[in-house]
Each structure stands twice: as C-alpha cells, then as structure tokens.
Interface confidence: low
C-alpha cells in the first residue's frame, strides 16, 4: 500500500502534520511540546523561580510552585501570616508576631514557652 506521510498523522499532542516530500513530514507542535512527532512535553522547570523550598511542578508550557505551608504566592516568596490564620496561637495574653517563614509569641506576666503556656 502507498505510504502517505500525514495519513494518518504521526504528530501527537495536537501537533499539525505537514508533508515535506514523498515520504517525509514535519510536525508543527503546539506550545509546550517538542520532538519530531511532538511527543515530548518541554520541561518548563529548568528556569523556575520557586523559592523557600517550593517544588517546581512542570505543566504544559507552564509550571507551578508547590509551596511549603508557611509560604505562599506565585514563587513561594510571600510569607503566610500565621497570626491571622491562628488567632489563638499565643496563650495567656501573649502577642503573636509574624516572621518570615513562621511566627513567634511575645509572652507577658511571667508566662513562657513557644505559645506562652508554660
């Protein structure tokens, strides 16, 4: 049977097949894919900017940062305000102080410990 390069199309992931000769073809890949048949998802993570222990998760023509709990934002560079998230983080009248990557308690009246409970 006669070989027709683009019938059926060898291009995957939405790539468009173009016949370049009697027995040759090329695939025009959608953004985010590469390879002779668009078989490879381009790794968008090599140039990532995930900070503070964020993990880069490759997507199709994009990436996302999976942030640890105490950080947020596109690149995990924004400090989560634990004092807002945990209104009762400090006991016995202690004052919650937000810090980069965490929080601390300023204790009063002789109380001590991480949460002023001692």
């Amino acid at each position: 049977s006669l070989y027709v390069p683009c019938a059926p199309s060898p291009c995957v992931n939405g790539g468009t097949c173009r016949q370049t000769g009697d027995f040759t073809f090329e695939c025009n890949c959608l953004p985010g894919f590469e390879g002779s048949t668009c078989e490879r998802n381009i790794d968008d993570c090599p140039n990532h900017r995930c900070q503070n222990g964020g993990v880069c998760v490759d997507g199709v023509n994009t990436y996302n940062c999976r942030c640890p709990p105490q950080w947020t934002g596109q690149f995990c560079t924004e400090d989560v305000d634990e004092c807002l998230l945990q209104p009762n983080a400090c006991q016995n009248g202690g004052t919650c102080a937000n810090r980069n990557g965490g929080y601390g308690c300023v204790c009063v009246n002789g109380w001590s410990g991480d949460d002023c409970s001692e």
Epitope: G32, D44, N47, Q51, N52, N61, T62, F75
Partner: antibody, heavy 117, light 112 residues
Framework: EVQLVQSGAEVKKPGESLKISCKGS????????IHWVRQMPGKGPEWTGY????????KFNEKFKGQATISVDKSITTAYLQWSSLKASDTAMYYC??????????WGQGTLVTVSS | DVLMTQTPVSLPVSLGGQVSISCRSS???????????LHWFLQKPGQSPQLLIY???NRFSGVPDRFSGSGSGTDFTLKISRVEPEDLGVYYC?????????FGGGTKVEIK
Amino acid sequence: EVQLVQSGAEVKKPGESLKISCKGSGYTFSNYVIHWVRQMPGKGPEWTGYIIPGSGGTKFNEKFKGQATISVDKSITTAYLQWSSLKASDTAMYYCARDGAGSFTYWGQGTLVTVSS
Amino acid sequence: DVLMTQTPVSLPVSLGGQVSISCRSSQSLVHSDGNTYLHWFLQKPGQSPQLLIYRISNRFSGVPDRFSGSGSGTDFTLKISRVEPEDLGVYYCLQSTHFPDTFGGGTKVEIK
C-alpha cells in the same frame, strides 16, 4: 540585612585551577537560588548559571556548560564557582546574585579574575 | 537565546532632565504564567549592578519614584523623571522569561 560577600581578586596563569566564593548572610541561605554572572571587560553582564542551595541542583547557560562548576556548602552559607583549567578568555569580573521576584535582587561586590601568562 | 536590544547606546543628559531608555526583545516576554519577566538594573562606575525595576514596572525596595518602567510584549521603556548625579552609569535590561536569562547591551547615561 541581606549581604553577599565574595572572595578577593585573583591573578592566574592559563591552565591553573581556581575556586571563588560567595558568602550569603542576613537571610535563609537554603531558600534562595544563587546565580553567577560574568562581565567581561567593557561588556555587559552574562548569566552563567545557578545553584539551588537547598538541593545542590545546578543549571548552566549552554554557552558556559563544561567550562566551570558551581557548588555550595550550606554549613557556611557559601556558593562557589570553580575552574579546573583556566583560559585567557575567562578573564572577567564574576558576580554572584541572589534570586527573587524572578530577577537578581541582591548582588555580591564581584571578584575580578585575571588569567594571563 | 532571546536577543535584548537597548537604545540608545549612549545618552548625554542634563541634571534635572528626563531620560528614556528603550529595550526590545527578539520575542515576546510574556510568560505562560501571565507575568512578564523584564527587569532594569543600574551599574554605577566600579560597582555591581543593582536592581531598579522588576517585572516591567515594580520598583525594588529603596528605589526612588523618579524611576519608572513601562511596556509590554517585546517593547519596554525605563524613564528617569529628574536625573540626579547618582543616576549616572550604565543601565541594563534583563529578561528572565526564557531560558537562559539574557541582558541588553547597556545604555550609558552621562552628563552632557
């Protein structure tokens, strides 16, 4: 205060090895990518490569691949750029810079490397 | 690699005057995450480059409001509204949307 302090100027002969350093302080060292940027005399800066201190993972500009290595010692919050065999064309100012906001937010003072016979 | 072209190469200015520096990229700098990673730096004589503007128009901490950035896609501009002596030096644009990060060739701002 965030600070990156680099080692002093070096004069070397072609073929010699060299390791220059960049000590970070005033922030959590492991949390931020450290870049190395080359600036040849009278030219603009060129991004060379980076290291992720937390994991030790590196990424290089293809143009510089195989010419130098980047390493880190987390215990002393220091990143390194190292050559095993210097060439005259390695003569340049080398800057380390801390990542942030998708850019280079803080820079070291630079280390001038001169390679001459 | 993305080519970053800055104009002019040299810019003679009067103190108190206004400055406009152009930076063009060989391809769009809009990242698939929606951000545009185009930044501006100043390198004063004998010093390290310092970040002025990140992601087109955001002033870095401590940068005076006489510096402003604008633009989109492939065309970007840095403006200095009232030039002061400490503004003299070489200005560079940098793109970090596409790997590898690439700098423009620089614009030297000097006294007329």
